[in-house]
Structures are given as C-alpha cells and as structure tokens.
C-alpha cells in the first residue's frame, strides 16, 4: 500500500512560520498577510516505526520538492538538514532512520523528536529569522512546540 501523506504548514508556539533560507535551510520568522505565502508546505508522510497513542512516526518532506528533513551526525553533533532524495523512490513506508521523526502530541501542541537521536527535537530560536535546528533541550530558551495547519492538496 502506498504511504499516506498530508500537506500542512507548521508554526512554533510563538507563531513564527517556517520559510526557506537558501536551498538547504529553513528559518523561522513572523509572517503576516500576503507574506504568509512564503511559508513552506510540508508533505507529512506516516511511515513505519514504533507507534503509540500520542507518538506517531512521520517523515517531513517539502511539498513538490525532492527535499526531506533529516538528522545526521556532523562533527559529532546531531544536526538537522534538508536532504535531497530521488523523487522516484520517496516517500516510502520504510524510510531510512535519519528521516524519521516521532510526532508527539501534548496539550494540543506538537513536538518532533528525531527517531535517530532520542530527546533531540526540531527547534526554533526565540530570535527572529534564525535557522530551524535540532536541539537537545526541552523547556529551555529554545522552542520545541509547534502547531500544524492543514493545507488542501
């Protein structure tokens, strides 16, 4: 069976939107009005992995782009990157480990934990216009909570 996917946008708990910053990076900033069209639309795919009521394994691709968020070690540090893939082969039910995030729902907010690096989360900075990154702390300065907005395909 083909992998199930939905289109969505994400905003952090400070209502910052995610936009492209160069070809392989996302940044978070406040957008209003027509600028909202700049925000990236994700194709969220529901993939194979350990699942529970509040934890669902997903892959986050950029809609109509052959790019996926992935988590790898760079200089011995877990790092978030946008990775290009062959569109003929993706998305797929069995994604490589680096592409998988545990989508965790807590109090109507979403966290995205790296399946490859437990307790590391997709994060944004308090500051405006800063890169989206993989952070190893929750509840500190950096933001790990998001809301999801469905986008019709």
């Amino acid at each position: 069976a083909p992998v199930r996917s939905l289109n969505c946008t994400l905003r952090d708990s400070q209502q910052k939107s995610l936009v492209m910053s160069g070809p392989y990076e996302l940044k978070a900033l406040h957008l209003q009005g027509q600028d909202m069209e700049q925000q990236v639309v994700f194709s969220m795919s529901f993939v194979q992995g350990e699942e529970s009521n509040d934890k669902i394994p997903v892959a986050l691709g950029l809609k109509e782009k052959n790019l996926y968020l992935s988590c790898v070690l760079k200089d011995d540090k877990p790092t978030l990157q946008l990775e290009s893939v062959d569109p003929k082969n993706y998305p797929k039910k069995k994604m490589e480990k680096r592409f998988v995030f545990n989508k965790i729902e807590i109090n109507n907010k979403l966290e995205f934990e790296s399946a490859q690096f437990p307790n590391w989360y997709i994060s944004t900075s308090q500051a405006e216009n800063m890169p989206v990154f993989l952070g190893g702390t929750k509840g500190g300065q950096d933001i790990t909570d998001f809301t999801m907005q469905f986008v019709s395909s």
Partner: antibody
Amino acid sequence: EVQLVESGGGLVQPGGSLRLSCAASGFSLSTSGMGVGWVRQAPGKGLEWVSHIWWDGDESYNPSLKSRFTISRDNSKNTLYLQMNSLRAEDTAVYYCAKNRYDPPWFVDWGQGTLVTVSS
Amino acid sequence: EIVMTQSPSTLSASVGDRVIITCRASQDISNYLSWYQQKPGKAPKLLIYYTSKLHSGVPSRFSGSGSGAEFTLTISSLQPDDFATYYCLQGKMLPWTFGQGTKLTVL
C-alpha cells in the same frame, strides 16, 4: 574492546533452516543509536548487505531476502540472530555480523564470519 | 536499488605506486559512502567513512574524495600490507549496497 563472535553456520540441505548467532561484547545492543546487522559473502564473490536492526528494534532487510530471513536480538544476552528459512544453494556464503552507529551507516566492527553451506 | 560500480575490477601495482580506485553510484548518494579493505579469509575493515573521513588507526596514505555519484579511494604510496580487495558501500538509501570490489595485486 568490541568483539563480535558469530556461530551457527554449517551444512544444511536446500529448503532447510538455520539460525545464526552473533554474541556481542564491549558494547550494548540497546545503546541509543546502535545498529548491528548481517553482511554475507559467497565464495569468491563480493559483499552483500543482508539485514540490520537498530537499538530500538527497527529492522531493515535486503528486499531479495526479506521473505525468508528474519533478524532479531536478545538484549539480555547481548546477542544478534539471523533466522534463515527455505535455504537455497545461492545462500551459501560466509555470514558476517557487523556493527555501526547511526544512519547513514558505516560498519566499524566486524565478526570473523560463519560459513553457511547449502547443499544436498 | 542503488547500483555501485567499482573500477577497475583488478589492479596490478608495485610498492610505492600511487593507486586510485573509483566507485560510481547509479544516482546521487550525497557523501554517504564508506570504503573497506578485505584480505583473503578475513573480515572487511573500515578505512574511510562519509566519503573522506579516515577511520581511527588507518594510515594517512589512504584518502577518499568525491560527491554525488563519483568517488575515489587513493593510496598515495602503496605498501606491502595494502595488497587486498577494496569495497565501497553506499548508505544513502535502503537497501545498502556494496560495489563489486577491486582486487589490488602485486605487479
């Protein structure tokens, strides 16, 4: 010191089954980020990746073998297994156990290998 | 699956020679490539990972380069201990696949 010691190889008839073991020491199979798997090498041929399991139980298989081979592990024994069913002559190979950390993979530590011969 | 093609399949060289082995992928594999050395009757040994990072304990005469779909393993000055078979492995996409190997023999 990391050690991987395979066992369970031997002569088996076509259609038969075999379970390989890989006893790991010097590290824990359940350590976050840890991966272990099987790579085989037919006599005089190159290396072929067979199967892999991550610390959290996430399994991957070479699609050409998935229906017949099953990877598993016992964390209490720190041991990896490969259950091989419906064996064919072309499964004759040395089977190596190999360890990696994280994806993308590179195999840092290898066992000495165990020979599986499928013949009547 | 991604097909990895090594060239040459066999290579004869002398001690002190500079040797280059090439590995081509059937599609872009980023820098997710590792190299292994294997001697007869022995398990493979990791030489290089992430295309160009030298594994600990591996002599500096070994180096790796490339990106995308074409990669090279270079031995700057061949030593007697280097005569072996070399394999590349791609980790970009499951199933992980090896090159067919390059056998390095004494000229």
